[in-house]
Interface confidence: medium
């Protein structure tokens, strides 16, 4: 851990690791019972993760901050570097035990050593994402996430080279969905469908999250999104371009949809 | 011509349920989504949820303020959309409008036709 | 959800007059629509995509507007403009309607 490469490795977590990999529903963070975490997992070919998998997932760098069903209905997160907000300042399985009650509600902890891969963590200065399949339409029921984390100091431009996702009021149905930080929880920027190209994104600060989310029904032909690590600008001009850029864009929609 | 018809609002008591029923007409009910807005009298619309099309399985999204309480759904060979209101409160009571929801891509979506309205009452 | 203000709630203007109305949303939006609505009967889609007006209504009305403010003007009023216009966003769901200018000819 530490400062290597000048960037900051602490900070990077796998989001997939020796198999291992974190669900939520598509309506969002703790809202799966153990049956449907089971379905959710079986429905990509795996299954849910046992207790060894994760802790040998959560080894070599797998670090969640939710707390997820694994086989035989026990629940936990993985936890590779304390923090404030998450682990209670411990590290390894966060371990809520078997719960009794299999209709609680939590995320779910996948296995699934031949699972197609999309998403991922990104230090590179340059790199393009691709919906899964791209320039092939993508498939139902896709969520990929795609964590970006640059020198400190730089910024991260966005932009959107091809876009095509299916069209639904809100973007309800399939979304690309951008954060300004390195979770999907804090700086959301906006939520994108359609097949306008969305305009350029600046972050505020050297981490950046996309989320890409496809339904049960109806597909398109998906996306490029290009970023370019933008280096430090001088003193005198830091801080006058640190909104995104995105406003203006006929297809970006602000604010979140939990409510929905 | 295009053409949305709302029936079965009226008087019902709190905690009663009561069914809506628009009757379109004039163009291919199954290609298009629809939706529920409602007028408080001598107030805004507000948008209760709306049904999508064919393609997307009839599946439906509704508002924070009746999700649980009431629901979307459609009859596709008489081209009949319904409003199912259960747990009906006093704030429930205004004008119910169907509408017609059009698109080009994602946010143009707005309501290009609407009903004549049905008027709801929810006292005791 | 988006909140969206329109101002003023009531007002009057005499034929010829020219007119503008504002919606002003509490976070930035893509477009605004514009519905009319006159007294007992129900809404008609009046301008939509912030500036484009829908088939039948009359070239003396215009939308235009950004961001977090959008507005609607009728560059000569007439009588058959009196009415109450309600903005909508659907950017953010849930899609939200102003609260409506109600314009009544003087």
């Known amino acids: 851990w530490g400062f290597k490469d000048g960037i900051f490795h602490n900070s990077i977590w796998l989001e997939r690791a020796a198999g291992v990999y974190h669900r939520e529903a598509r309506s969002g963070k703790y809202k799966l019972t153990y049956a449907e975490a089971k379905a959710v997992c079986e429905f990509e070919g795996g299954h849910l993760a046992t207790y060894k998998q994760l802790e040998a997932a959560r080894k070599i760098g797998f670090h969640v901050c939710a707390a997820g069903w694994m086989a035989k209905g026990r629940v936990g997160y993985p936890i590779v570097k304390p923090g404030p907000n998450c682990g209670f300042g411990k590290t390894g399985i966060i371990d809520y035990g078997i719960r009794l009650n299999r209709s609680e509600r939590w995320d779910a902890y996948c296995y699934n050593p031949h699972a197609k891969e999309c998403g991922g963590v990104f230090t590179d200065p340059k790199q393009i994402f691709k919906s899964p399949g791209f320039p092939n339409e993508y498939e139902d029921n896709q969520i990929c996430y795609w964590h970006i984390r640059l020198k400190y100091g730089q910024r991260i431009h966005l932009s959107f080279l091809d876009f095509d996702l299916e069209d639904d009021p809100g973007c309800l149905a399939d979304y690309v969905e951008i954060y300004d930080s390195y979770d999907d929880v804090h700086g959301f920027v906006g939520r994108y469908c359609g097949d306008e190209l969305p305009d350029d994104i600046i972050s505020t600060g050297n981490v950046m999250t996309l989320k890409f989310l496809s339904d049960a029904s109806v597909t398109a032909g998906g996306f490029q999104i290009k970023y370019v690590a933008m280096d430090p600008v001088s003193k005198s001009s830091q801080g006058k371009n640190t909104s995104t850029t995105s406003t203006g864009n006929k297809n970006f929609l602000a604010g979140r949809f939990s409510h929905l | 011509e295009v053409k949305l018809v709302e029936s079965g609002g009226g008087l019902v008591q709190p905690g009663g349920s009561l069914s809506l029923s628009c009757a379109a007409s004039?163009?291919?009910?199954?290609?298009?989504?629809m939706s529920w807005v409602r007028q408080p009298p001598g107030k805004a619309l507000e948008w209760l949820g709306f049904?999508?099309?064919?393609?997307?399985?009839?599946?439906?999204e509704y508002s924070a303020s009746v999700k649980g309480r009431f629901t979307i759904s459609r009859d596709n060979s008489q081209s009949i959309l319904y409003l199912q209101m259960n747990a009906l409160r006093a704030e429930d009571s205004a004008t119910y409008y169907c509408?017609?929801?059009?698109?080009?891509?994602?946010?143009?979506?707005?309501?290009?036709?609407w009903g004549t309205g049905t008027t709801v009452t929810v006292s005791s | 959800q988006i909140v969206l203000t329109q101002s003023p709630a009531i007002m009057s203007a005499s034929p010829g007059e020219k007119v503008t109305m504002t919606c002003s949303a509490s976070?930035?939006?893509?477009?605004m629509h514009w519905y009319q609505q006159k007294s007992g009967t129900s809404p008609k889609r009046w301008i939509y995509?912030?500036?484009k007006l829908a088939s039948g209504v009359p070239a003396r009305f215009s939308g235009s507007g950004s961001g977090t403010s959008y507005s609607l003007t009728i560059s000569s009023m007439e009588a058959e403009d009196a009415a109450t216009y309600y903005c909508?966003?659907?950017?953010?769901?849930?899609?939200?309607f102003g609260s409506g200018t109600e314009l009544e000819i003087k």
């Open positions: 004039g163009f291919t009910f199954t290609d298009y989504y």
């Open positions: 995509d912030t500036s």
């Open positions: 909508q966003q659907w950017s953010s769901n849930p899609p939200t």
């Open positions: 509408a017609r929801l059009y698109y080009y891509g994602s946010p143009h979506w707005y309501f290009d036709v």
């Open positions: 976070s930035s939006v893509s477009y």
């Open positions: 049904i999508r099309h064919k393609a997307k399985g009839y599946t439906a």
